[in-house]
Interface confidence: low
């Protein structure tokens, strides 16, 4: 066990030309925070892969307001380290994603607005217990300077935090074959003997006699890949031929948990413990958010329209997929409207338009809105070769030149009189009637005959607008 520590030194404009605009302004003050995501190994990770080694958010930095006319300086940073605890062995090789987030401090209902300013990623080799490693990474016009290290939590020591240290039993020196535990020179490396036969490649131990498995391996000696672990179920009678337990029918048979989730039985069914980034009954739903940096190839990540939707990647030209992971023939998306011919030039798309159409995507019908105006604040809507006006409230007709009469349809019931009003219409009800359209008779005893309770409200319910 141990902790990965990240110290951000500076975040500001890079050295090249074209300094970025300050992310904050007097009108919209903001502050920065950082997120680090760690994954084991050096291989390319799938877009959905969670931060399997862990993730951490920094505190918020000081509020920053741009000085008008001044270039974007190094921005004020949060205090302290970002710390990512790891429970098992430190893998030695890891991938990281460091994101710089902006928190706008306007008055948003439901909380402050967040947006991703910059995202850097890399793969590194790092031994636990070593000195701080310094790094500089650039993301567009921004530059991030930081240091990082991995340190073991006592009693673990070593480059993978898998050796244990114990206080010396004798004051002078350690026992035979045991070294002092730097930097804790008053402690000695503990004799650590894993369970006999524990796989040296796929197993490790933090206590003598145990055998703990690295991800993807299982079994008492960590010799069985997870996908072939059908003999490890404790249920059912032992099979004489295979020497393993033949599982009886059980809810976890075949591991119903997707995406690396682990299955445990419950009295009535099963429960999946999902890895970070997934959720759902069977870990089938990706719970990755923009904070996990899921958009590849320069895709822009935004939260979904609903706070419960995790993220949406807006892909740059040439890429598609929910994570912008697929390179596309952009013409297959048929971007040219109205029968235009698509040309993918690599650096850009061109549309060769048919006669009578124009625009980057042949979207303008030259017979539509060109040179036509809609009166009284109406807007022209193109399509079908004939222009149409969407008129402002109170106007109608082909060109919005006619004043609309909201009372023309006689909307007031029971002899109510209709008055046109800037916001629509108002009904003045005849005696004995009430309601927005005079639709309800007023009983002589003063009670009103309101309509039956709408579906979902029982009579007598307060009609809350919630």
């Amino acid at each position: 066990a141990g902790v990965f520590e990240l110290q951000i030194h500076s975040f500001g404009p890079g050295p090249g030309p074209g300094a970025p605009r300050s992310p904050c302004s007097a009108r919209l003050p903001c502050r920065l925070f950082f997120r680090v995501c760690l994954k084991p190994g050096l291989s390319e990770e799938a877009a959905e892969s969670p931060c399997a080694l862990g993730a951490a958010l920094s505190a918020r930095g000081p509020v920053y307001t741009e000085q008008p006319g001044a270039p974007a300086p190094d921005l004020p940073l949060p205090d302290g380290l970002l710390q990512v605890p790891f429970r098992d062995a430190w893998p030695g090789t890891f991938s990281f994603i460091i994101e710089t987030w902006r928190e706008e401090l306007g008055d948003q209902i439901g909380g402050p607005a967040w947006s991703l300013l910059a995202r850097v990623a890399g793969r590194r080799r790092l031994a636990a217990g070593g000195p701080w490693a310094r790094d500089i990474q650039r993301a567009g016009a921004w530059e991030l300077r930081f240091s990082y290290r991995a340190r073991c939590e006592p009693p673990a020591v070593g480059t993978a935090c898998t050796r244990l240290c114990r206080p010396r039993s004798a004051p002078s020196r350690c026992g035979p074959g045991l070294r002092p535990c730097a930097p804790l020179e008053d402690e000695c490396e503990a004799p650590l003997v894993c369970r006999a036969g524990c796989s040296p490649e796929h197993g490790f131990c933090e206590q003598p006699g145990e055998c703990r498995c690295l991800e993807g391996w299982t079994g008492p000696l960590c010799t069985v890949p997870v996908s072939t672990s059908s003999c490890l179920s404790p249920r059912g009678p032992s099979s004489a031929t295979t020497g393993c337990l033949v599982p009886g029918p059980g809810p976890c048979d075949g591991n119903p948990c997707a995406n690396g989730g682990s299955c445990s039985e419950t009295p009535r069914s099963f429960e999946c413990t999902c890895p970070r980034g997934f959720y759902g009954l069977r870990c089938e739903v990706s719970g990755v958010t923009c904070a996990d940096g899921p958009c590849f190839n320069g895709g822009l990540c935004v939260g979904g329209a609903d706070p419960d939707s995790a993220y949406i990647c807006h892909c740059p030209p040439g890429f598609q997929g929910s994570n912008c992971e697929k390179r596309v023939d952009r013409c297959s998306l048929q971007p040219c409207r109205n029968g235009g011919l698509c040309l993918d030039l690599g650096h850009a798309l061109r549309c060769r338009c048919r006669a009578g159409f124009a625009g980057p995507r042949c979207e303008h019908d030259l017979d539509d809105c060109a040179g036509r105006a809609c009166a009284n604040g109406g807007t022209c809507v193109e399509g079908g070769g004939a222009h149409r006006c969407s008129c402002a409230l109170g106007f109608g007709g082909r060109d919005c030149r006619e004043r609309a009469d909201p009372c023309a349809a006689r909307p007031c019931a029971h002899g109510g009189r209709c008055y046109a009003h800037f916001s629509g219409l108002v009904c003045a009800c005849a005696p004995g009637y009430m309601g927005a359209r005079c639709e309800f008779p007023v009983h002589p005893d003063g009670a009103s005959a309101l309509p039956a309770a709408p579906p979902g409200l029982r009579p007598g319910d307060p009609q809350r607008y919630l």
């Epitope: 925070f33 958010l57 505190a59 918020r60 209902i109 439901g110 909380g111 402050p112 959720y279 739903v285 719970g287 958010t289 904070a291 979904g304 329209a305 609903d306 706070p307 419960d308 939707s309 995790a310 919630l466």
Partner: antibody, heavy 124, light 106 residues
Amino acid sequence: EVQLVESGGGLVQPKGSLKLSCAASGFTFNTYAMNWVRQAPGKGLEWVARIRIKSNNYATYYADSVKDRFTISRDDSQNMLYLQMNNLKTEDTAVYYCVRQGYSYDWGPWFAYWGQGTLVTVSA
Amino acid sequence: QIVLTQSPAIMSASPGEKVTITCSASSSVSYMHWFQQKPGTSPKLWIYSTSNLASGVPARFSGSGSGTSYSLTISRMEAEDAATYYCQQRSSYPPTFGGGTKLEIK
């Protein structure tokens, strides 16, 4: 296992005050936004208040019906959520539920895990 | 704020029968959540983000919909499904619940 146990309900007179508590266990309390939801006897559900986590400055939000009368707060060191209710009205009579958001760091369904509820009766 | 109207308010179904409960929103919402509540117990999250079943929910339940119209469907009604079901949105602040649909077993 996620556990939310409400307490502090009871009979109170109109314009009186009451403080509800919710003891949370089985999860890392300080990484989850929390809510109070109420249910009047025989009626539907109504969201009352919400409090976010420290990294969101413990921001609080209230239903219009309780604004300026109720105060939601939390004590992360004790894994406790509170609802201070002042100037109570008869229409505040309900079972009050302590409810945890689905996923840590302010993500997922707001009302994923519910306590058993505590009854508040406002009556003269 | 968005008003959610559930229909029907009360319904009964025979075992094995297909059941559909609808939830209509006064404005478009992006997702809908559903809760189940049995008498004397707390509500339980049943379906989240329109179509995802919460932990322990039988596969005979499903959710669908978009915009202003959402539904919860039980492919084959069972006695244990008798309960009140509420829809809930939080696409728009404040979060709101439907008035509930009481589902009884015939």
